[in-house]
Interface confidence: low
């Protein structure tokens, strides 16, 4: 049965060419995490595998930076970045979970973290 | 490789208050979240709370509004401050980290709810 919760940073905001860190966190299980997958949209940006460490997927590699822990940082962001974003999380022996966090790159220099909260 | 020692567990009547502390040594703040878990007797280990080095913070449902967790990075040290403590709260609590992105587990400490 799988007990576990996805919790994210949930909405946020940047400006153009900043950076941000997207971040999840697995909760409410002992499940044992073996991969740690990113995407955007139909995407892979990267993979963070338990024994064999991560990967960035070469289209993203100057941009892309892993972590912190689980999480992935996002540079020289244009505002083709906006969108969503989801962290895959395969366990055993629960399974895959899912969390979702949507990405705004302004323009502007107002830019601001919105609300931090649990995607359902 | 990542050490952990929890410490602040004991005996307390219901209603009461404790604070558990987990000193980690190696690098453990690189970025990675710290937290706790619990088991009480007889029953599976369950997740009670987690701290981001940023300061986020998430607590299971049974703790909310009595609980805080919280750390120092100085120190690579995480607290677990309990109040309106219930003899269902009784357990053996552990830390955890994942700093490098995968679990270590401290030795635990015991607390005990009880009039």
């Known amino acids: 049965m799988m007990t576990g919760t996805i919790e994210t940073t949930g909405n946020i905001s940047a400006e153009k060419g900043g950076s941000i860190i997207l971040q999840c966190h697995l909760s409410s299980t002992t499940a044992q995490v073996t991969q740690v997958n990113w995407e955007q949209q139909d995407q892979l940006l990267a993979i963070c595998n338990a024994d064999l460490g991560w990967h960035i997927s070469p289209s993203f590699k100057d941009r892309v930076a892993p972590g912190p822990g689980l999480g992935l940082t996002l540079q020289s962001l244009t505002v083709n970045d906006t969108g969503e974003y989801f962290c895959i999380y395969h366990t055993y022996p629960d399974g895959t979970y899912t969390g979702r966090i949507f990405l705004e790159v302004l323009e502007s220099s107002v830019a601001e973290h919105g609300a931090r909260f649990q995607i359902p | 490789e990542v050490q952990l020692v929890e410490s602040g567990g004991g005996l307390v009547q219901p209603g009461g208050s404790l604070r558990l502390s987990c000193a980690a040594s190696?690098?453990?703040?690189?970025?990675?979240?710290m937290g706790w878990f619990r088991q009480a007797p007889g029953k599976e280990r369950e997740w009670v709370a987690s701290v981001l080095r940023g300061g986020y913070t998430w607590y299971a449902d049974s703790v909310k509004g009595r609980f805080t967790i919280s750390a120092d990075n100085s120190k690579n040290t995480a607290y677990l401050q309990m109040n309106s403590l219930k003899p269902e709260d009784t357990a053996v609590y552990y830390c955890?980290?994942?700093?490098?992105?995968?679990?270590?587990w401290g030795q635990g400490t015991l607390v005990t709810v009880s009039s």
């Open positions: 955890t980290t994942e700093g490098s992105g995968w679990r270590n």
């Open positions: 190696g690098n453990t703040f690189s970025g990675g979240f």
